[in-house]
């Protein structure tokens, strides 16, 4: 009985619980189209259980798959502006190490002001993922239209 | 030690695996932004598991980071009609207790007749989340076209 | 020492950790709206782990609650095109066994070039999931625009 | 079994007013959302006006725009369409019409009409 | 605004022939397209929504076809009892607007 009871256990910290939400901090310096990151229970409701920052960038701790998200929304933008200003377009991808680089999701803005989107992908240890906004406008940093999350899912 | 080690484990009924999937019932009166959800088998698809309707708008029974998405369609919709009403916004947040009011997730439809997005969040047991649409256009009731759901991931 | 072990196994197979990301092999014949999917690690980060391909439709192996996400990019596509073109719907449904034949997510591209939602849904060992694409346009294959999965969430 | 039945009509003259009223039964009419159609003598349908299931959003065809109002009452699950500055071309039979539940769309149900007739 | 046309204006058919009525839309309105059926002093009646879906009650006789911007009522062997004027609308975006309809007669 002991036994078969033992068998529902599940020692928390094996689940491989890492998961992350970031929200923006800054866009990059000119020629650098990456958007740097920030995330921490001090700034609001973003948050690192596992993964960890490197220099705005999201480096992963555990192999598995993950959950990829995002949500970028343009600041000062209409359907006009959107259009006048195309090709703004969000791309997320592995970027260091420079081996496994790839792009895992990408998404133009055509005529809207933001983009949402999400998939699963197999993530490393060391895996570093960037998200590059290409394009003259300008992301919103409101939380709760720019933000920037993944989570793992399985081994 | 028997202890220290008991504390390691997590009965698998114990997971948390909280979740609910709503489809529309209705919109608010007049000066009320809220759309109402309603969920359970015999409406179809939708169910809640762990997570509670409390007119209309979900209640959240235990902490923890969850994964918050919604699919918003504007019926009788066309770009023309959707940027011709535009501004019509979609906002997802806690409402209640009021001491942790807050914005989660914010679209705008611009010329476009659907906002589908997704977030990780923190929520705690007792926050209710209201999903406000404001603007003149209705939500298609449509169970394919409107939902909202949430998905606990962690503690 | 057996039974200390027995306490921190769960096997991963009864997790049902089943999961299947796929990217866009091909289109159907005329007068077949589907969209054909394929996946394997030989064709970059697609795979399926648990769900199974059927003349490149998922095949579900596990009852549960799953989290089914999409994302598809028309090829060849600008605002002007995807609104000339309109209308062009995207839906994912159960097409298999008939019985339980039912639309899960649908969304239209209006002025947009790219569509992605998600929703929580309950699905049965046997279920095929179909998604149709329905309008003269053309995705893209590219599989970082394209792409389709399912993550097993709870029984 | 729905019903809709519609009172209020009648004969006035030019610019002046007139409420009509369409009381439902057989189905929750607080979660359905209704419009007004007419047609003039002897022509075709004319979309007029349509109100959301909580009255929270109304629309309205341009021909009738800031002069006609609809409202309802869902406690009396009643639908009302205040008619002022009324001119001759807006004679009719008036038919109260639901919406079907999914999409605010076409009028799965309708009523038998009331006739409105504008003339000096 | 939509503007949908209906041809014939008239139509006489035969008794158990087939009636085949057809509306235009000036641009497209996906399947959003419902038929009525208005018989002389009475209210309409809905009988196809999303351009191919028969509303409740309806006999099979009836069908609808089409999406875009051309659509088919059919039906396909007339009763005495379908002499009455049809009418389509769309419903994909407002003002919602209504063909002028069609006269069904037997011949």
């Known amino acids: 009985q002991r036994f078969a009871q033992a068998q529902q256990q599940l020692p928390l910290e094996s689940l491989g619980w890492d998961v992350a939400e970031l929200q923006l901090n800054h866009t990059g310096p000119q020629q650098d189209p990456r958007l740097y990151w920030q995330g921490g229970p001090a700034l609001g409701r973003s948050f690192l259980h596992g993964p960890e920052l490197d220099k705005g960038q999201l480096r992963i701790h555990r192999d598995g798959i993950y959950m990829v998200h995002i949500q970028v929304t343009l600041a000062i933008c209409s359907s006009t502006t959107a259009s006048r200003h195309h090709p703004t377009t969000l791309a997320v991808g592995i970027c260091s190490p420079a081996s496994r680089s790839i792009s895992l999701l990408r998404l133009s803005f055509h005529q809207g002001c933001t983009i949402a989107s999400q998939r699963l992908t197999p993530l490393a240890r060391g895996d570093t993922l960037c998200t590059n906004l290409t394009g003259t406008l300008l992301p919103s940093r409101n939380t709760d239209e720019t933000f920037f999350g993944v989570q793992w899912v399985r081994p | 030690q028997r202890f220290a080690q008991a504390q390691q484990q997590l009965p698998l009924e114990s997971l948390g695996w909280d979740v609910a999937e709503l489809q529309l019932n209705h919109t608010g009166p007049q000066q009320d932004p809220r759309l109402y959800w309603q969920g359970g088998p015999a409406l179809g698809r939708s169910f809640l598991h762990g997570p509670e309707l409390d007119k209309g708008q979900l209640r959240i029974h235990r902490d923890g980071i969850y994964m918050v998405h919604i699919q918003v369609t504007l019926a009788i919709c066309s770009s023309t009609t959707a940027s011709r009403h535009h501004p019509t916004t979609l906002a997802v947040g806690i409402c209640s207790p009021a001491s942790r009011s807050i914005s989660l997730l914010r679209l705008s439809f611009h010329q476009g007749c659907t906002i589908a997005s997704q977030r990780l969040t923190p929520l705690a047991r007792g926050d209710t989340l209201c999903t406000n649409l404001t603007g003149t256009l209705l939500p298609s009731r449509n169970t394919d076209e409107t939902f909202f759901g949430v998905q606990w991931v962690r503690p | 020492q057996r039974f200390a072990q027995a306490q921190q196994q769960l096997p991963l197979e009864s997790l049902g950790w089943d999961v299947a990301e796929l990217q866009l092999n091909h289109t159907g014949p005329q007068q077949d709206p589907r969209l054909y999917w394929q996946g394997g690690p030989a064709l970059g980060r697609s795979f399926l782990h648990g769900p199974e391909l059927d003349k490149g439709q998922l095949r579900i192996h596990r009852d549960g609650i799953y989290m089914v996400h999409i994302q598809v990019t028309l090829a060849i596509c600008s605002s002007t095109t995807a609104s000339r073109h309109h209308p062009t719907t995207l839906a994912v449904g159960i097409c298999s066994p008939a019985s339980r034949s039912i639309s899960l997510l649908r969304l239209s591209f209006h002025q947009g070039c790219t569509i992605a939602s998600q929703r929580l849904t309950p699905l049965a060992r046997g279920d095929t999931l179909c998604t149709n694409l329905t309008g003269t346009l053309l995705p893209s294959r590219n599989t970082d625009e394209t792409f389709f999965g399912v993550q097993w969430v709870r029984p | 079994e729905v019903q809709l039945l519609e009172s209020g009509g009648g004969l006035v003259q030019p610019g002046g007013s007139l409420r009509l009223s369409c009381a439902a039964s057989?189905?929750?009419?607080?979660?359905?959302?209704m419009s007004w159609v007419r047609q003039a003598p002897g022509k075709g349908l004319e979309w007029v006006s349509t109100i959301s299931d909580s009255g929270g959003s109304t629309f309205y065809a341009d021909s009738v725009m800031g002069r006609f109002t609809i409202s309802r009452d869902n406690s009396k699950n009643t639908l009302y369409l205040q008619m002022n500055s009324l001119r001759a071309e807006d004679t009719a039979v008036y038919y109260c019409?639901?919406?079907?539940?999914?999409?605010?769309?076409?009028?799965?149900?309708w009523g038998q009409g009331t006739l409105v007739t504008v003339s000096s | 605004e939509i503007v949908l046309t209906q041809s014939p204006a008239t139509l006489s058919v035969s008794p158990g022939e087939r009636a085949t009525l057809s509306c235009r839309a000036s641009?497209?309105?996906?399947?959003?397209l419902a038929w009525y059926q208005q018989k002389p002093g009475q209210a309409p009646r809905l009988l196809i929504y999303?351009?191919?879906s028969r509303a409740t009650g309806i006999p099979d006789r009836f069908s609808g076809s089409g999406s875009g911007t051309d659509f088919t009522l059919t039906i396909s062997s007339l009763q005495a009892e379908d002499v009455a004027v049809y009418y389509c609308?769309?419903?994909?975006?407002?003002?919602?607007?209504f063909g002028p309809g069609t006269k069904v007669e037997i011949k």
């Open positions: 019409a639901r919406h079907d539940y999914s999409n605010y769309a076409f009028f799965d149900y």
């Open positions: 999303g351009a191919s």
């Open positions: 641009q497209s309105v996906s399947s959003n």
């Open positions: 057989g189905f929750t009419f607080s979660t359905y959302a």
């Open positions: 609308q769309q419903y994909y975006s407002t003002p919602f607007t």
